[in-house]
Interface confidence: low
């Protein structure tokens, strides 16, 4: 199709080489077409499309994204050619940064229902650059945490080194929805609730003498509880003796509950005490068996191919540790009688 009639928007993605970050493009169709195509009256009288920075109503997935090759080849369907780019309704998600993402992206309705719809398209010229500004050493991360129940803030990474006074007007989106009230480079959250978690996008306009660009950054916000003040506790084994049959295989499980820590480095290991000797056992990897907002239960097993007489003289010790402290639980094997 002829893309010369598409409205054009220029975007700049400056990515940090020291962190993983994502990027998004919204299918931001121009207003006349948006009202004609994107807000077709397909809703029941009780429904009203909520405001989106792109298409509203039930047409959310009715768009097609293309990339325009720089060599003038025909448009390429994003879904077929670019595995690191995912289409979610009207949003294009770039999972990995890199200058190879630079280019022209076109979105338009899948269903062309009238001659007016032909021009219902938008061309986004995306320029991707690595961040070179060394003066801004402490720019905000693209992954930010908010502590539940307290006051918090979300900073726009591309503007976090500027004071609020210097900062240009910023447009914020949360999970694709416009946050109409927020206009500065930092959103202050009065009280953090679980629904503040999500993908935030901040946009501002940068102009030179020739043209203007929308500088965009994406922030993944996670709501968290405060770091635990407790050392981990061992849920299993509970007993300090275990009846076993000689010559049979045996698996002893150690399950421990670790409270939430922002920087989480849990330790769970088995070691054996035999008279004055003590050594760590190489056992299968630990695995998380339950994870909630407040804590995580991790399990690690020790496997004996067959229980020997010598094993009855040993103590099998599960050792767990977090940044607060450690806990141990030892198990003595006892031969089953009868």
């Amino acid at each position: 199709f002829n893309i010369s009639g598409c409205s054009t928007k220029k975007l700049l993605w400056t990515y940090s080489t020291r962190s993983e970050e994502e990027f998004v493009l919204f299918c931001d169709l121009p207003e006349p077409q948006k009202s004609h195509f994107c807000h077709r009256n397909r809703l029941s009288p009780k429904q009203v499309p909520e405001h989106l920075p792109f298409m509203g109503s039930n047409d959310l997935s009715d768009v097609q994204w293309y990339q325009q090759p720089s060599n003038g080849d025909p448009l390429e369907d994003i879904r077929k050619s670019y595995p690191h780019i995912i289409q979610d309704k009207c949003t294009l998600h770039f999972l990995t940064p890199g200058v190879n993402n630079s280019g022209s992206y076109i979105c338009r309705p899948k269903m062309i229902k009238s001659p007016y719809d032909v021009a219902c398209c938008v061309k986004m010229i995306l320029e991707v650059k690595p961040q070179t500004n060394a003066s801004c050493e402490y720019s905000a991360s693209h992954k930010q945490d908010l502590l539940l129940g307290s006051t918090g803030s979300i900073s726009c990474p591309s503007l976090s080194c500027q004071s609020d006074a210097q900062s240009p007007a910023v447009t914020w989106y949360k999970n694709g929805k416009l946050l109409s009230v927020e206009r500065s480079n930092r959103i202050v959250v009065d009280e953090v609730y679980d629904y503040h978690q999500g993908t935030y996008v901040c946009d501002y306009t940068q102009s030179d003498t020739v043209s203007s660009w929308t500088v965009r950054a994406v922030v993944q916000v996670r709501t968290i509880v405060g770091d635990t003040k407790l050392k981990p506790d061992i849920l299993d084994p509970v007993e300090d003796t275990l009846e076993v049959e000689l010559g049979k295989p045996l698996t002893i499980s150690c399950k421990a509950r670790f409270g939430f820590e922002r920087v989480f480095n849990p330790v769970i290991k088995w070691y054996i005490k035999d008279s004055d000797l003590e050594w760590e056992v190489s056992v299968p990897e630990a695995k998380s068996i339950k994870s909630t907002l407040k804590d995580e239960i991790i399990e690690r097993n020790i496997i004996l191919e067959k229980v020997t007489q010598r094993d009855l003289r040993r103590k099998f010790v599960c050792f767990v540790q977090n940044s607060i402290g450690n806990t141990t639980q030892s198990v003595q094997l006892k031969e089953k009688r009868g």
Epitope: V48, H51, S180, V181, E182
Partner: antibody, heavy 122, light 111 residues
Framework: EVQLEESGGDLVQPGGSLRLSCAAS?????????ICWVRQAPGKGLEWVAC?????????YYASWAKGRFTISRDTSKNTLYLQMNSLRAEDTAVYFC?????????????WGQGTLVTVSS | DIQMTQSPSSLSASVGDRVTITCQAS??????LAWYQQKPGQAPKLLIY???KLASGVPSRFSGSGSGTDFTLTISSLQPEDFATYYC?????????????FGGGTKVVIK
Amino acid sequence: EVQLEESGGDLVQPGGSLRLSCAASGFSFNGNYYICWVRQAPGKGLEWVACIYAGSSGSTYYASWAKGRFTISRDTSKNTLYLQMNSLRAEDTAVYFCVRDKPAGGSSYTLWGQGTLVTVSS
Amino acid sequence: DIQMTQSPSSLSASVGDRVTITCQASEDIESYLAWYQQKPGQAPKLLIYQASKLASGVPSRFSGSGSGTDFTLTISSLQPEDFATYYCQSTLYGVNFVPNVFGGGTKVVIK
């Protein structure tokens, strides 16, 4: 059919208490939107009272005049919203509407109940 | 909190008249404004959202305009069923909850 139905309105003496209920049908009180109370005194305009977030946090918001006297709550198992009103005054006499709102830019009250009348008089 | 001021508080008009109601916000609310119609003994009904978008099932004689602080509801040709009270409402939503404040209302009566 998606609807809200208020109940519990009554004649009550000044200083008394009353609990209003709002039963939802066709949707659940557990999602990314607000359920709110809006009131209207006889012959007067609409006035926002309080909202509760229908997500798991159940966070609550009140008009400044309602704080301390009114409490909004919900029972997700019964799909019901409540407004507990204490220390009632004559000026609280109004029709109380239960409404649903979506937390998105430019949202509006698209779903209203029929209202329940609260009369505060001696 | 934002204040919403509606004018006039009442107006009398005849069937076929063009009617204009205005609403002023105490601060910039961009296009985040809704208009409701309420008839006696009934719950309000949404007419316009986002300042100018017609809610589903609302006749095209109703239109909304404006942005920032000044907004207008226009009924191009008043019909008998349009005699009612009209309210504007700010519909801002931020990361923090913003109370959705109503204007005082405009009663449209038969001349």
